[in-house]
């Protein structure tokens, strides 16, 4: 018995084919011998079946022995054995159908589950294999998950189902809703202006929620919410706002946000939530503000560095197209009675610089200048 | 990262048995199917068999029906294959593949059985 | 069983060549189909399924065309590293089968 299967939604073709290339009388059954459709002459006659309006053939093809039962908008349902009768002999196909799918919205939050779900005929016992847009497989039976959704599952995945040694292929596109970034840094002098961005990692027609930035001070021994907003079709509107920083949001996607002068008591952490509509759960971005500032105070060159930075870094003291006079893994050095020039403030990481600061000492009846 | 590691080589008599294991490590091991391929000195590839490591449901090539059976031991991340009946023209290098029904991603070392007298 | 056919047996061929193999099924395997490269005492490396999908950390000089019975693997320009021997495999049903394979020598 040939064995065909067919994908739930989809239309299959039963092939039928008489020994002789004419048209010739012939129809198909199902396995409780109900008559599906069949030929009088060279019309197409439809039986009482269930799949009346959804069965058709190919006429063209009947004059030359073949005689097709095409299903259309196949269900699970459908499973079942075709028989077609043609020249007194009996060709039986065996239909299987399958639908796979996702047993939530297919948009579903960083970190959350995905679960597939086959639907297969009664008796069957098919093998699923997925894989994913970046290559990870999972494998199951009547449901499939993978917990702890990543960004680069975002796409297309593709599932091979098998059932009697044949095979059949679904593709579920997936979005995982989640920023471009889980965690950002800004590396700003003192009084410059800072701009925080918060890129989504995907796209939708219509996008609504509501947000808020919390953020830790690292002088600060509470955090405290820095703004809120909600976000209606794309469009963003402030409801509230702390009075100092003052902050500024952008009205439109990408989430951007303004602080007009970075401050060492503004240097911290933040981290921004995004509730969206008829999601459980919130996205996260992680935003880090560092701030650099250098003095000199009477006979004192000092630099200093605010905010979350790593061990790792070094900050260094140095007279302009010279050696670093002090370099340490600390976030102050100074330098006692400097010499007359321009000295930098360096902020950097294995060699690459992240942050620099610039500061003219004059000669020691002078007072010092900041560019 | 991916890897297959397979026991070392054999010399079987004809009419005995061999039974050939594959440790896998680097992904879930029940996330992938494994079948084994064979492949005679000088000769081309041989498709013998497949395990759904999730379910435990086996399919065999025709040829090899009746004298290989595949199994596997989650516990383990291990894949067994035994031949047995063996003859002369079993020997052969045997790998054991990843098998996620679109291809054969990540192969083991491959384990030569030879089969002599 | 679904015969697979690969021609030609063996091909020389130079570093900077275009190369093309095909592969024949003795009935459509729709695009259920991998190309394999094997260098000796050495184990077979997945280059495409799918009939075109190229597979991740294969250089991109490797293409893979054609569905229904016949098929084609390229090697756009050929490196010292290709000269190998190839494979095609078709996944559509079990048992899965094997082109008898093709040699790439250096001309």
């Known amino acids: 018995k040939k064995v065909v299967l067919g994908k739930k939604g989809d239309t299959v073709e039963l092939t039928c084919t008489a020994s002789q290339k004419k048209s010739i009388q012939f129809h198909w059954k199902n396995s409780n011998q109900i008559k599906i459709l069949g030929n009088q002459g060279s019309f197409l006659t439809k039986g009482p079946s269930k799949l009346n309006d959804r069965a058709d053939s190919r006429r063209s093809l009947w004059d030359q022995g073949n005689f097709p039962l095409i299903i259309k908008n196949l269900k699970i349902e459908d499973s079942d054995t075709y028989i077609c009768e043609v020249e007194d002999q009996k060709e039986e196909v065996q239909l299987l159908v399958f639908g796979l799918t996702a047993n939530s919205d297919t948009h579903l939050l960083q970190g959350q589950s995905l679960t597939l779900t086959l639907e297969s005929p009664p008796g069957s016992s098919p093998s699923v294999q997925c894989r994913s847009p970046r290559g990870k497989n999972i494998q199951g039976g009547k449901t499939l998950s993978v917990s702890q959704l990543e960004l680069q599952d975002s796409g297309t995945w593709t599932c091979t189902v098998l059932q009697n040694q044949k095979k059949v292929e679904f593709k579920i596109d997936i979005v995982v809703l989640a920023f471009q970034k889980a965690s950002s840094i800004v590396y700003k002098k003192e009084g410059e202006q800072v701009e925080f961005s918060f890129p989504l990692a995907f796209t939708v027609e219509k996008l609504t929620g509501s947000g808020e930035l919390w953020w830790q001070a690292e002088r600060a021994s509470s955090s405290k919410s820095w703004i809120t907003f909600d976000l209606k079709n794309k469009e963003v509107s402030v409801k509230r706002v702390t009075q100092d920083p003052k902050l500024q949001m952008g009205k439109k996607l990408p989430l951007h946000l303004t602080l007009p002068q970075a401050l060492p008591q503004y240097a911290g952490s933040g981290n921004l939530t995004l509730a969206l509509e008829a999601k459980t759960g919130k996205l996260h971005q992680e935003v880090n503000l560092v701030v650099m500032r250098a003095t000199q105070l009477q006979k004192n060159l000092t630099c200093e560095v605010w905010g979350p930075t790593s061990p790792k870094l070094m900050l260094s003291l140095k007279l302009e197209n010279k050696e670093a006079k002090v370099s340490k893994r600390e976030k102050a050095v100074w330098v006692l009675n400097p010499e007359a020039g321009m000295w930098q403030c360096l902020l950097s990481d294995s060699g690459q610089v992240l942050l620099e600061s610039n500061i003219k000492v004059l000669p020691t009846w002078s007072t010092p200048v900041q560019p | 990262q991916v890897q297959l590691v397979q026991s070392g080589a054999e010399v079987k008599k004809p009419g005995s048995s061999v039974k050939v294991s594959c440790k896998a490590s680097?992904?879930?091991?029940?996330?992938?199917?494994i079948s084994w391929v064979r492949q005679a000195p000088g000769q081309g590839l041989e498709w013998m068999g497949w395990?759904?490591?999730?379910?435990?449901?086996?399919d065999y090539a025709h040829k090899f029906q009746g004298r290989v059976t595949i199994t596997a031991d989650e516990s383990t991340s291990t894949a067994y294959m035994e031949l047995s009946s063996l003859r002369s023209e079993d020997t052969a290098v045997y790998y054991c593949?990843?098998?996620?029904?679109?291809?054969?991603?990540?192969w083991g070392q491959g384990t030569l059985v030879t089969v002599s007298s | 069983d679904i015969q697979m056919t690969q021609s030609p047996s063996s091909l020389s061929a130079s570093v900077g060549d275009r190369v093309t193999i095909t592969c024949r099924a003795s009935?459509?395997?729709?695009?259920?189909l991998a190309w394999y490269q094997q260098k000796p005492g050495k184990a077979p490396k997945l280059l495409i399924y799918?009939?075109?999908r190229l597979e991740s950390g294969v250089p991109s000089r490797f293409s893979g065309s054609g569905s229904g019975t016949d098929f084609t693997l390229t090697i756009s320009s050929l490196q010292p590293e290709d000269f190998a021997t190839y494979y095609c495999?078709?996944?559509?049903?079990?048992?899965?089968?094997f082109g008898q394979g093709t040699k790439l020598e250096i001309k």
């Open positions: 593949t990843t098998d996620d029904f679109l291809s054969f991603g990540y």
């Open positions: 680097g992904y879930t091991f029940t996330s992938y199917g």
């Open positions: 395990i759904n490591t999730y379910s435990g449901y086996t």
């Open positions: 009935e459509s395997v729709s695009t259920w």
């Open positions: 799918k009939a075109s």
């Open positions: 495999q078709q996944s559509y049903k079990t048992p899965y089968t």
